[in-house]
């Protein structure tokens, strides 16, 4: 805490300018008027203050706005944003996407800090939903942002926002998240033709049910193995050998290299060896000829 001392004669700040970088901390505290600082916040970021000095300026703003800063000040915080705590940010009401962008810019190129996470949370809650422009902005700064949300939070993403999602934004999503996102993507892209639809929906297919995979197998989509390996195991298991062959097209040969990994391994165990042999890939582990396959899950459902 900076001690309260009178401002030396002739040092009272008339404006926020570069001369202030030569003020000691106590001089900044004594000689810079908080109201002046608030009205000239747009100048602060261009002045090469130390963070030590920025701490003093923050203290002045905190005294002026104990209930939280107005957006006119927040928008121009620049590197002063790095001195804010999540508790400070929880007092803010940030409604402008421009303000959000300005603050994310300060943190650009670095992992998401607790301050940024709190800021985004405040912003999204204030908007009520994760609209397309917001999602566009957030994924531009943090490609992994979408996958950091819980399935419950993802449920507030409107289907229209899905157009902003790039394949790399989903790289770290787990199946529970894709389960929520896939139906939204299906709805968003429903009016596209076959090949265009597949290009868009491909990164979301980790949330697709069996019936949708069966439908895709009828459309000559030639799914690559990387996408196939990310499909839900429970969605792949009921697919026939013929359906998987159609789904993968020329990529079907890749099954051999993946035969020990899920979901391929589990799928092989469910197929008749005869059917697997028709692929000519040497896949082993299918059900031998003459064996009867009982679907116990069906039996349980009937009892």
């Amino acid at each position: 805490e900076v001690e309260k001392t009178a401002c030396p004669s002739g040092k009272k700040a008339r404006e926020i300018d570069e001369s202030l970088i030569f003020y000691k901390k106590w001089e900044l505290e004594a000689c810079v008027d908080a109201a002046l600082l608030a009205t000239q916040m747009d100048r602060v970021n261009a002045i090469p203050f130390t963070y030590e000095q920025l701490d003093v300026l923050k203290h002045k703003l905190d005294e002026l706005y104990p209930q939280g800063y107005p957006e006119s000040v927040i928008q121009h915080l620049g590197y002063l944003f790095l001195k804010m705590s999540p508790e400070d940010i929880r007092k803010w009401n940030v409604t402008s996407l421009e303000t959000l962008k300005a603050l994310l810019e300060v943190n650009k190129g670095h992992e998401m800090s607790p301050q940024v996470a709190t800021l985004i949370d405040r912003f999204v809650k204030g908007r009520g939903q994760l609209d397309k422009d917001t999602l566009d902005t957030l994924t531009a700064f943090y490609p992994g942002y979408l996958c950091s949300l819980s399935p419950e939070e993802l449920s507030s993403v409107p289907p229209s926002s899905i157009w902003a999602v790039r394949p790399q934004d989903l790289d770290t999503c787990d199946p529970r998240q894709l389960d929520v996102l896939y139906p939204k993507a299906r709805l968003a892209f429903q009016n596209m033709n076959g090949s265009e639809y597949f290009v868009k929906i491909q990164s979301f297919l980790g949330g697709a049910p069996t019936e949708d995979l069966k439908a895709l197998s009828q459309q000559n989509v030639s799914m690559d193995l990387a996408t196939f390996m990310k499909l839900r195991t429970d969605a792949v298991l009921p697919l026939t050998v013929a359906e998987v062959q159609k789904l993968l097209g020329p990529h079907v040969e890749g099954l051999k290299a993946e035969e020990r990994h899920r979901p391929v391994r589990d799928w092989i165990l469910r197929q008749r060896q005869d059917d697997l042999d028709t692929l000519g890939l040497g896949l082993q582990g299918g059900i031998p000829n003459g064996y009867l396959v009982l679907d116990l899950s069906m039996q349980e459902a009937l009892s």
């Epitope: 090469p48 203050f49 130390t50 963070y51 030590e52 590197y79 790095l82 001195k83 670095h110």
Partner: nanobody, 116 residues
């Protein structure tokens, strides 16, 4: 983390000169260039001179015309040439910079004493 090491301090008579050096152990990514600061006993640290990333130099009124800040990028070193030294220049001199993440970095300091 980059280390900052100051050298060149010493005892000098009023009117004398010293050249301080600040060597960095690697390339620094600074938001506000590199600065020379000083702290006299019982006083707060103050900026004396700063050289920005674009080469612009800035000086405190009390040292203008007497001190010169410069840098040699090939040697990762910043200098402070101090001429016409006065007793009130006596202090520990530090070089320092601010990163892009909210932290200030300082060297360990070098003592400058101006005394007859």
């Amino acid at each position: 983390q980059v280390q900052l090491v100051e050298s060149g301090g010493g005892v000098v008579q009023p009117g004398g000169s010293l050249r301080l050096s600040c060597a960095t152990s690697g390339t620094i990514f600074s938001r506000n260039g590199m600065g020379w600061f000083r702290q006299a006993p019982g006083k707060q640290r103050e900026l004396v001179a700063r050289i920005l990333n674009d080469g612009t130099t800035m000086y405190a009124d009390s040292v203008k015309g007497r001190f010169t800040i410069s840098r040699d990028n090939s040697k990762n070193t910043v200098y402070l040439q101090m001429n016409s030294l006065k007793p009130e220049d006596t202090a520990v001199y530090y070089c320092g910079y601010s990163d892009y993440r909210g932290t200030d970095y300082w060297g360990q300091g070098t003592q400058v004493t101006v005394s007859s």
